[in-house]
Interface confidence: low
């Protein structure tokens, strides 16, 4: 019952806590179970005991085995066992199951991934994070204290996350890595009739002849994953891909954004080198899902350059 599995990688620091707890004033003795040999407390040793903690600085594969800790108080003794396994470093990227800490789940609202066991170590920022062996980059990822925060969590964020930090012991630095799986769970979602946020119905957009113009069709469809939702532009009731005017292009690949928890889609219509004839067209922003279709119409008007009179 009072046994705990611990694992680490060779040449990394590993610190193990005794599974039996006691007051800081209680003494804790550590033994290597197979030989009943006492673990020294002198810090000059590679493996040494420090109160409730057993420290491997750094660990070696040969350290694997069962360690006994005895918490001694004036009135009782409590015995615990730490089953320690030290593995050779993997040459490839895959982290085997036996090196994984408990899986955590996240959602759009809560996407913290705590670095496992870090509280046992004397570490200082920064904490490095990797997903499937790739260093995490970009503003969506924020290393904060002992956890990682992911903004705008998506299903693609699921995967194996590794934290890497440095443990400092009496001026000597030791590397530590720990990996856990992260799964993304959908919060309860709903679907509603599309709401077009832009453009406004019958909007007139001013453009300059000869310049480029962008029109954005933006609509929201509900909360959570939407099974059928799309926004698109039509010209005079015709799909952009079939209109046959290469100057006028949709920004292919819809951006899925979440504003106020809502699932929204954007589609940008790009008009290169605006011509007079473009002012005659009707531009329709269409948003559709299982509930139906909503259409907002835009027309272009010429932006008159300001007259300069002497």
């Amino acid at each position: 019952k009072f046994s705990k599995q611990s694992w680490g990688l060779e040449n990394e620091a590993l610190i193990v806590r005794c599974p039996r707890q006691g007051k800081p004033s209680y003494t804790v003795d550590w033994y290597y179970s197979q030989t009943n040999k006492s673990i020294p407390t002198q810090e000059r040793n590679r493996v040494f005991a420090s109160g409730q903690l057993l420290k491997f600085l750094p660990a070696a594969v040969a350290d694997s085995g069962i360690y006994t800790c005895i918490v001694r108080s004036p009135t009782f003794n409590r015995t615990g066992y730490a089953n320690v396994t030290i593995y050779k470093k993997q040459s490839d990227c895959n982290v085997p199951d036996y090196l994984m800490y408990s899986t955590v789940s996240g959602s759009e609202k809560n996407s913290k991934i705590y670095c496992p066991t870090i509280d046992l170590y004397n570490w200082t920022a920064p904490l490095e994070w990797f997903k499937n062996c790739q260093a995490l980059q970009g503003s969506r990822y924020r290393a904060h204290k002992s956890f990682l925060v992911i903004d705008n969590v998506m299903t693609e964020d699921a995967g194996d996350y590794t934290c890497k930090f440095i443990h400092n012991e009496n001026g000597a630095n030791y590397s530590v890595t720990a990996t856990r799986s992260f799964t993304v769970k959908d919060e309860q979602g709903f679907s509603l009739f599309p709401v077009i946020g832009a453009p406004a119905q019958n909007e007139i957009k001013e453009v300059e002849i000869g310049k480029n113009a962008n029109l954005t069709c933006s609509a929201c469809f509900g909360k959570g994953t939407q099974f059928l939702a799309a926004v698109l532009w039509q010209l005079n009731g015709t799909k952009i891909t079939d209109f046959g005017e290469p100057r006028i292009q949709q920004e292919e690949g819809q951006n899925q954004s979440f504003s106020n928890g809502l699932a929204c889609l954007d589609m940008v219509l790009r008009i290169a080198d605006v011509k007079e004839e473009d002012l005659l067209l009707q531009y329709d922003c269409l948003a559709l899902n299982l509930h139906g279709l909503r259409r907002h119409t835009v027309r272009l008007s010429r932006k008159n350059p300001i007259d300069h009179h002497s």
């Epitope: 891909t241 079939d242 292919e252």
Partner: antibody, heavy 117, light 110 residues
Framework: EVQLLESGGGLVQPGGSLRLSCAAS????????MNWVRQAPGKGLEWVSA????????YYADSVKGRFTISRDNSKNTLYLQMNSLRAEDTAVYYC??????????WGQGTLVTVSS | DIQMTQSPSSLSASVGDRVTITCSGD??????VSWYQQKPGKAPKLLIY???NRPSGVPSRFSGSGSGTDFTLTISSLQPEDFATYYC????????????FGQGTKVEIK
Amino acid sequence: EVQLLESGGGLVQPGGSLRLSCAASGFTFSRYAMNWVRQAPGKGLEWVSAISGSGGNTYYADSVKGRFTISRDNSKNTLYLQMNSLRAEDTAVYYCARVWRNSLDYWGQGTLVTVSS
Amino acid sequence: DIQMTQSPSSLSASVGDRVTITCSGDRLGEKYVSWYQQKPGKAPKLLIYENNNRPSGVPSRFSGSGSGTDFTLTISSLQPEDFATYYCVARAVRGNPHVLFGQGTKVEIK
């Protein structure tokens, strides 16, 4: 992840026919115009044909007009090129490619068509 | 058929060199030009679209410029993995959506 996978190439005699397929995945197929491009052994790239997103509009290079037919089945996410009256000069690796922002942003790995007696 | 004229057809360069490839097509009128890299036995890879835009994932040493009739691909500092054949492709802004390929430029190790 966008993927395009061509198939249907092979050895055919002059005057024969072949039908190439390009299976698309990882994007909303019906919203993109598609192209076929070919490359004769040791030569440069040559545009062959294009088709609009719905399949309503098709375009051909002069060298294949009247012999090749481009089509698509959006329900199957598949692009086709029916090649009839094949000639030795049609021997090439045929690529399908997706149109995006007036460019061809994703290409398949190609399928080899050899026209020889 | 209208053709894009690409030059040079081949060039020898060393790692670290600045390399410039040009493409012109005066009879095409206004056009969009894109640039592609192709390695032997592989499909072409998009480097530049709409004259001067770089897709994500393409190194910043690749840049495109030009308008009207003449367009240029520049590799600011040639890397070992850049030895390949480069193609320009033009698409007319107006009219049919045919794409026209340049003849290609093979960049070899000096």
